[in-house]
Structure formats: C-alpha cells, structure tokens
C-alpha cells in the first residue's frame, strides 16, 4: 500500500530524505523539486544543496536537519492545499546515471473546523473570505530571512503521519535513505 505524508493547512510539512556521506563533510549535491523526479535534475526546484551548503531555496522551504550529516529532509512552512502533490528528493551522486531519486507524496488536509459534520472540500462554506480558492490562493511572499526559529520538536510531525501505513516510530526509517561510499 502506498506511503504518503500528511500535514494540515497552516502547519509545517516534513518530507524525510537521507543519505550517509562517505566521509564527514564529503557532501553530495541534493535537489528538491515539485512533481515527480525527471530523468535528470529536479523539476520546479524549490531547494538545492552543493558540496558545501544550501545554495538555492525558495520561500517556505528549508532543511531543518543537519544536512552535513546527510539529513536532507524538507520542511515546508505553513502549508496550503496547493502544496499537495509529489515531491522529488534527488541525491546527485557523481557518475553517469548514479543519482538516487525518491518520489514522496504529500497530502494536505483542511484545518479542523468545528463543528464539521462532513469533510470540508468546497471552501466557500467553511471559509467565506477564501471564496473558492481551495488552497490555490496567491503565492506567499515571505522571505526566508523573516521565518521564525523553529526546531524539530515544534514541527508537527504527528500531522505528517504515514498515510495508509504504520506511523513510523523513527522518521529516519520511514524516509528515503541511502548510503554512499
């Protein structure tokens, strides 16, 4: 059965992806993109690392773990329904066609509204000010520099349980993990 990660609208989503560097500090470039992994690179890139640092990122997307130890898990801040979909984590191992690629499914749930007799899908009724945007409103303009300091314990990982599978006790075991070297 398929593995999916979940978050609620307004929360932070966590998409696990890991590799084991051959030696400390011997990093491999990684890219994260929206949509399934293409043959090369990432499509619709949201974040990229090189051999030393995070060298490209877009608003709301960051690496919260220690990427220098191979934790390249993606955190998406303040998600909306429009963030639902497939995300590609690509570990760009040197050599022809050596890349490891992982397609992770992220499902965003509407925020709980009380009372809620049925699952709210047509947002006109639940949030009149949102009209029928269904999570497809204007893109956020917040910059990375203005994001609050958030640590792992504050990230609502419970809202990102593995859908249709056991809730992993260890997120590292549930994520995309490879060993290099």
């Amino acid at each position: 059965s398929e593995v999916e990660y979940r978050a609620e609208v307004g929360q932070n989503a966590y998409l696990p992806c890991f590799y084991t560097p051959a030696a400390p500090g011997n990093l491999v470039p990684v890219c994260w993109g929206k949509g399934a992994c293409p043959v090369f690179e990432c499509g619709n890139v949201v974040l990229r690392t090189d051999e030393r640092d995070v060298n490209y990122w877009t608003s709301r997307y960051w690496l919260n773990g220690d990427f220098r130890k191979g934790d390249v898990s993606l955190t998406i801040e303040n998600v909306t329904l429009a963030d639902s979909g497939i995300y590609c984590c690509r570990i760009q191992i040197p050599g022809i066609m050596n890349d490891e690629k992982f397609n992770l499914k992220l499902v965003i749930k509407p925020a709980k509204v009380t009372p809620a007799p049925t699952r709210q899908r047509d947002f006109t009724a639940a949030f009149p000010r949102m009209l029928t945007t269904r999570g497809h409103g204007p893109a956020e303009t917040q910059t990375l520099g203005s994001l609050p300091d958030i640590n792992l314990t504050q990230i609502s990982t419970l809202a990102n349980e593995l859908r249709d599978s056991r809730l992993a006790n260890d997120l590292r075991d549930s994520g995309a993990t490879i060993r290099i070297g």
Epitope: G43, L81, S84, K109, P117, R119, D122, T132, R163
Partner: antibody
Framework: EVQLVLSGAEVVKPGASVKMSCKAS????????MHWMRQKPGQRLEWIGY????????KYNEKIKGKATLTSDKSSSTAYMELSSLRSEDSAVYYC????????????WGQGTTVTVSS | DIVMTQSPSSMSTSVGDRVTITCKAS??????VAWYQQKPGKSPKLLIY???NRYIGVPDRFTGSGSGTDFTFTISSVQPEDIAVYYC?????????FGGGTNLEIK
C-alpha cells in the same frame, strides 16, 4: 497498488434504474473521497459528484442533481452509484476515480462501465 | 461553473514533432489545472497537476505551464504511443470541469 474495479456493462430500458459498484483496494478506503464521472460518446468528461466513505458526506454536480445517488460500504471498500429514470441521453461510460487527497485531480480511475439506455 | 475551452480539437502530427495544446479557463484558476491522456477504450491517465507538476511515471517529454486563465500542454517529441485524446481539467473549485479534448493523430 491502488485499484478501482467497476462492475460490468449495463443495457437498460428508458425509465429504468441501474446501480453500479466500484471496489477499491490498495489503500484505506475511508481516507479518500470517491468521485464519479461520466463521458457521453464523443463528449468531454463530466463530474457527477463524490462521496466521503468516512462520514457519508456527499456532494453532487448541481447540473445533474437527482440523476445519481451515491452510497458506500466501508466493510467491502465499495462505492456505489445508482442512476434513476434513465433516458437515452444518459448513455455513457461511467467512471469512479480517487483524488490525491483533498485536491480534485485524479491519479486513480476505474476502468469505466458502459451504460446503454435503449428500448 | 468554470468553463475550460481547449484548442485545437484535433491535430495531426509526425513522430518527433513538438506539439502544443492550449486551454483557457473562463475565470482565474491560479495554477489549478491538470492534464490527462485518454486512449480509446481506456480510462484517463493523469499526466500533469497544478499546471506544471508531472505525476509519477510520466515521461519528461510531457510538460505543462501557465497560470490564471491560460494554460499550455506540450509534448516535446511525439512518440507513436502518444496517440490519444488529451484533456485539461480545472481543480480550483467544485465542480471540477474538463476541456473538450484534443485528439492527437499521427500523419
């Protein structure tokens, strides 16, 4: 692997009713709503409505409300659609489809079931 | 309801050609557009969602773009197996609505 399997083709007389089933497997049935579409010969796809098996919440396309009745059975992971007062213009291929989850694009479709209304 | 107007309704192409299909929404749907491929006697297959995001298993030659009311679907190099009808669909609001389809044929 997610699979949606529809019941077989139906040939019915005008005014009659027909009930088709869509059996889901490969995922937790109550975690996703089930959508229904139809496609008349040579025409575009048309959304009929959805049912939420978790709480039996239902939403219909206002344009064709009253034609279809959606139900589901959690114990067998099966969704049903009953079409009533059938007329020749209801002849179409009918599909069930599962969305990605709270967003209305459809990665998973049943194979389609043909309903022919003919006297 | 949002009306999705797709063009052309049919087109003839050769293997290796680049093909572009357009879809226009009757109102702003931001990037909430999906594209499907349907072969004769088969169910639609999701190719692109949210205007430009490829679904799992979809070849790189299929791409989508656009926002607001104007959307484009491109096959960079048509293959024989791409012969099908292609539909756009808005997933911005209920009810989801589909374009009229583009029938792609090989010369």
């Amino acid at each position: 692997e997610v699979q949606l399997v529809l019941s077989g083709a139906e040939v019915v007389k005008p005014g009659a009713s027909v009930k088709m089933s869509c059996k889901a497997s490969g995922y937790t049935f109550t975690n996703y709503v089930m959508h229904w579409m139809r496609q008349k010969p040579g025409q575009r796809l048309e959304w009929i409505g959805y049912i939420d098996p978790d709480n039996d919440g239902i939403k219909y396309n206002e344009k064709i409300k009253g034609k279809a009745t959606l139900t589901s059975d959690k114990s067998s992971s099966t969704a049903y659609m009953e079409l009533s007062s059938l007329r020749s213009e209801d002849s179409a291929v009918y599909y069930c489809a599962r969305d990605f989850g709270y967003v209305d694009w459809f990665p998973y479709w049943g194979q389609g079931t043909t309903v022919t209304v003919s006297s | 309801d949002i009306v999705m107007t797709q063009s052309p309704s049919s087109m003839s192409t050769s293997v290796g050609d680049r093909v572009t299909i357009t879809c226009k929404a009757s109102q702003d749907v931001t990037t909430a557009v999906a594209w499907y491929q349907q072969k004769p006697g088969k169910s639609p297959k999701l190719l692109i969602y949210s205007a430009s995001n490829r679904y799992i298993g979809v070849p790189d030659r299929f791409t989508g773009s656009g926002s607001g009311t104007d959307f484009t679907f491109t096959i960079s190099s048509v293959q024989p197996e791409d012969i099908a009808v292609y539909y756009c669909q808005q997933h911005y609001s209920i009810p989801p609505t589909f374009g009229g389809g583009t029938n792609l044929e090989i010369k």
